[in-house]
Interface confidence: medium
């Protein structure tokens, strides 16, 4: 009877060992499958994320194009209205000019001496930019970047004057420290009579002959409204 029990015990042990091995194999199989599923999910997730990102970028880009299109359309319809009217009042900015706070701005990409830049603006029925506020300063600075650029301020006839008659003394100023200094040490003859934006946006007086970029400005007619889209 004892040997029979031992035999049964051995059988039970073998069965249990087989069961354990089989269970382990199944668990291993499941975890491998689980890993594969997990990897597959991760891969699908990242694909989905990428597609969402691409879609979002496309959407942003499309939105920008639509905005630009609307702006161009408004500008063109305004230009047409101006051409059809008697042309005495400026109701919208010319093509390639930037509208901001009821003024139009044009930013050069080449350089001229101050007098030539001033003349260029006048030929466009405009004037070199006149900066009347910190807000306008920031707007212009954003567009010109860190490049020396002429503005409509000079003291060629004595006191500092804005080209459009805006009062200099009571108006906005943004000079660099120790400027204006009417420096004579440049060896080009005379002092420095024309103001420009420096690379950090603050102003400096310099020799008017230097070939700097420039900004033209013209004001929109006060009474004008945005024309409706055609």
């Amino acid at each position: 009877q004892n040997s029979q029990l031992q035999e049964e015990l051995r059988g039970l042990r073998e069965t249990f060992s087989n069961f354990t091995a089989s269970t382990e194999a199944q668990v291993k199989g499941l975890s491998t499958q689980g890993g594969n599923v997990g990897r597959k999910m991760k891969s699908l997730e990242s694909q989905l994320e990428k597609q969402q990102k691409d879609l979002s970028e496309d959407h942003s880009s499309l939105l920008l194009h639509v905005k630009q299109f609307v702006s161009d359309l408004r500008s063109l319809s305004c230009q047409m209205a101006a051409l059809q009217g008697n042309g005495s009042e400026r109701t919208c900015c010319p093509v390639n000019w930037v509208e901001h706070e009821r003024s139009c701005y044009w930013f050069s990409r080449s350089g001229k001496a101050w007098a030539d830049a001033d003349n260029y603006c006048r030929l466009e029925d405009a004037h070199l930019v006149v900066v009347t506020s910190w807000e306008e300063q920031k707007f212009v600075q954003h567009h010109i970047g860190p490049v020396n650029t002429w503005m409509g301020l000079h003291d060629q006839n004595g006191p500092w004057k804005w080209v459009d008659g805006t009062d200099y003394e009571t108006g906005f100023k943004n000079w660099r420290p120790e400027q204006p200094d009417d420096w004579y040490g440049h060896g080009l003859g005379g002092g420095e009579d024309c103001a420009h934006f420096t690379d950090d946006g603050r102003w400096n007086d310099d020799v008017c002959q230097r070939p700097y970029r420039w900004v033209c400005e013209t004001e929109l007619d006060k009474a004008s409204q945005e024309p409706p889209l055609l």
Partner: antibody, heavy 122, light 107 residues
Framework: EVQLVQSGAEVKKPGSSVKVSCKAS????????INWVRQAPGQGLEWMGE????????FYAQKFQGRVTITADKSTSTAYMELSSLRSEDTAVYYC???????????????WGQGTTVTVSS | DIQMTQSPSSLSASVGDRVTITCRIS??????LAWYQQKPGKAPKLLIY???NLAEGVPSRFSGSGSGTDFTLTISSLQPEDFATYYC?????????FGQGTKLEIK
């Protein structure tokens, strides 16, 4: 003596961000622009952007727009350049440089940091 | 953006030679150009600014010329320490692009 001292080398994974510092000394930090230039292995110099610490005005190269952020801490005279969404092509030496100036003349980078090597690898 | 074409891309010369490197720009940048020298593993070093002005501490054998769209860096008599890579860079609006570089090697 003017000095620009940059932070140490970095190893980053693709998709992550890196922030490199540039500590200035020997001059008035707010009086000059700080620029960032990078150089990929065996390649030329590539301008990334500029900050004016006085006003925090920044200008970035179109190529890096939206991925690079340049900041400055006036209290410690330190400029920072953070580049996000890193990819292997961003592996390069990153330099900070001070933009000098003389009135009525051009600009130029007169002082440079020693460079920071950024390696992007998975 | 402004395009910079620097030539030659590499150049072999001997000590004592006169060497000229040119930089051609896609539009008029007046005098807004600088030249740099870079040695392996080191940061670039300013040589010339505003097209013709020698930077502080730079030997007088280096000189710059040109304005508008064509610029030249000249080394009148090459010294052993001059073997390096040279870059031009414009400052006429951002981006402040660099030329592709000229590697100056010993013949």
């Amino acid at each position: 003596e003017v000095q620009l001292v940059q932070s140490g080398a970095e190893v980053k994974k693709p998709g992550s961000s890196v922030k490199v510092s540039c500590k200035a000394s020997g001059y008035t930090f707010t009086a000059y622009g700080i620029n960032w230039v990078r150089q990929a292995p065996g390649q030329g110099l590539e301008w990334m952007g500029e900050i004016f610490p006085r006003s925090d005005a920044t200008f970035y190269a179109q190529k890096f727009q939206g991925r690079v952020t340049i900041t400055a801490d006036k209290s410690t005279s330190t400029a920072y350049m953070e580049l996000s969404s890193l990819r292997s092509e961003d592996t390069a030496v990153y330099y900070c440089a001070r933009k000098g100036r003389e009135y009525g003349t051009s600009h130029y980078f007169d002082y440079w940091g020693q460079g920071t090597t950024v390696t992007v690898s998975s | 953006d402004i395009q910079m074409t620097q030539s030659p891309s590499s150049l072999s010369a001997s000590v004592g030679d006169r060497v000229t490197i040119t930089c051609r720009i896609s539009e008029n940048i007046y005098s807004n150009l600088a030249w740099y020298q870079q040695k392996p593993g080191k940061a670039p070093k300013l040589l010339i600014y505003a097209a013709i002005n020698l930077a502080e501490g730079v030997p007088s054998r280096f000189s710059g010329s040109g304005s508008g769209t064509d610029f030249t860096l000249t080394i009148s008599s090459l010294q052993p320490e001059d073997f390096a890579t040279y870059y031009c860079q414009h400052f006429w609006g951002t981006p402040f692009t660099f030329g592709q570089g000229t590697k100056l090697e010993i013949k």
